[in-house]
Interface confidence: low
Amino acid sequence: EAHKSEIAHRFKDLGEQHFKGLVLIAFSQYLQKCPYEEHIKLVQEVTDFAKTCVADENAENCDKSIHTLFGDKLCAIPKLRDNYGELADCCAKQEPERNECFLQHKDDNPNLPPFQRPEAEAMCTSFQENPTSFLGHYLHEVARRHPYFYAPELLYYAEKYNEVLTQCCTESDKAACLTPKLDAVKEKALVAAVRQRMKCSSMQRFGERAFKAWAVARMSQRFPNAEFAEITKLATDVTKINKECCHGDLLECADDRAELAKYMCENQATISSKLQACCDKPVLQKSQCLAEIEHDNIPADLPSIAADFVEDKEVCKNYAEAKDVFLGTFLYEYSRRHPDYSVSLLLRLAKKYEATLEKCCAEGDPPACYGTVLAEFQPLVEEPKNLVKTNCELYEKLGEYGFQNAVLVRYTQKAPQVSTPTLVEAARNLGRVGTKCCTLPEAQRLPCVEDYLSAILNRLCVLHEKTPVSEKVTKCCSGSLVERRPCFSALTVDETYVPKEFKAETFTFHSDICTLPDKEKQIKKQTALAELVKHKPKATEDQLKTVMGDFAQFVDKCCKAADKDNCFATEGPNLVARSKEALA
């Protein structure tokens, strides 16, 4: 229904706390370089304005769209051009072009220092002095580094952060309490960030239809007892919500997400038997719980999929009369029977089925032609199953760090032109798939592995798109979203690459490495490994093992030495010489 004042409507629906959080996220995602203090000033101005509109919807400017109000605020920032260059050109445009322009300037890899967590005592002091400001900083810092983070979910993580600090800051050993809990929140949030970026990529590149297909498959797996009409309704709503968030309509997105949670909880009987525990929670937790809900039990009496989609003589007629709905039912029926498949795989199967019908329904004897389609699915199913098997075996053998290194070598060989920091980040994330998925029960492994890898590879594509350097990466990234992972898996050593010349300074290290946290140490070593592969793309596994083992020993030895600097200065060149020799 239409409201006189959109901003008053959202303020009333969301409440002041969530309204302010979402406005802060929106501004931080659009203008990623602005300091917190500047954004919070704008947030307060917008909030005060919203309150005047709640009091009187006919007050001046209250009838303006939220994009207009937000855009006007951003464009009024002094020195916008100095800080943001051509983003300031957006301000010359009218809505909706202005908002589109802002969206195009979102930077997936902003030049910001890594988010450093303050030391436990300092954190607790600032949290206890001003919890609102502390959590506001959290929202700001995460949102500006992840300009597509799903805003209502970020509010949920801020709530979690709040819970952890409230609990741990009263403990005697604050650090022991905080570190594992905040690490867990961070890990979940980082995965959420790449997953949401993938959803926005899907929406941006392939439109709502592609996203809705993804949603139908996912919902059908989770709610196999729901009827297709119900699944379609949920998928349509989820598509709308994600479109809003990806498009910067964060207030509407969060409001609609809360509405969907309400609808699901009011209609549990027709959706799933597993929802009740979620429905007792407050709004942010309820939505998050529903988004992570376990699959309902598959109905016992489902007939074979072949009856309707292969054996039926009317398949072509049904397909011709309503292609999208017919394919939607196929996707629904197949997905509800296969919670053990990844959504990417289910969409590939639906695509294969569609291609088969397109071909066969134009032939003389369609049933004979499409009669073997389910058997033709077999290689498509086997490929990701083998991927999971071989990678999980390798992970079990090497552990997370070793597995990351194996992936790093593999991907540096596939795309040696890609910058080393991007390759290291991608390999570290891809390597985490082992810890995340390989320990799960067999039936959950494939969906976990493939859908996670797809999201990480989407991040690689997004970064590569900014500065394209590898034709192979461009080719894999330009194709359909569901074909990306198989495309990357199929890449081999890039024979066209001219190896990088050996630069001693790339492999020169100093005593500062000794005081780095373990994670940073690993990144230094992995950076060296990627550079080695760029120098010798065809180096054998044994050669790389020898060099990296030698390197690890060198770091260990010099970090234990009395005169660290001297050790690095004298032993370093010897290491470089030995490495060159080993790789010759």
Epitope: E227, F228, T232, K233, V315, V325, F326, T329, Y332
Partner: nanobody, 126 residues
Framework: EVQLLESGGGLVQPGGSLRLSCAAS????????VAWFRQAPGKGREFVAG????????YYADSVKGRFTISRDNSKNTLYLQMNSLRPEDTAVYYC???????????????????WGQGTLVTVSS
């Protein structure tokens, strides 16, 4: 569980019209794919027309296209079959069948419909 009850059959002259109704209970009719079938004496059950669940996409047998119209009234939870230009070969017992969880009539095979009404007789004769 879905219960179906047909009504509206009767004797009609060739060229005449009839409107059959199928009242459903136990489930909302718009959530289920529903269809009309007919069975002439000594013959198998034959698909006449169907409508999808949750999506108003209709299907017709070639022999009735342009003459029969299937529709439903969700508020009354009832399925209808408007039959015009009736012919003697339309004489049969008409049944409605339901397939819960099916958005489309992806099959015109009677065996795939788990729920049936008891049928209503339509006789077309001068």
């Amino acid at each position: 569980e879905v219960q179906l009850l047909e009504s509206g059959g009767g004797l009609v002259q060739p060229g005449g019209s009839l409107r059959l109704s199928c009242a459903a209970s136990g489930r909302y009719i718009d959530e289920t794919a529903v269809a009309w079938f007919r069975q002439a004496p000594g013959k198998g059950r034959e698909f006449v027309a169907g409508i999808g669940g949750g999506v108003d996409i209709t299907y017709y047998a070639d022999s009735v296209k342009g003459r029969f119209t299937i529709s439903r009234d969700n508020s009354k939870n009832t399925l209808y079959l408007q039959m015009n230009s009736l012919r003697p070969e339309d004489t049969a017992v008409y049944y409605c069948g339901a397939r819960p969880g099916r958005p489309l009539i992806t099959s015109k095979v009677a065996d795939l419909y788990p729920y049936w009404g008891q049928g209503t007789l339509v006789t077309v004769s001068s």
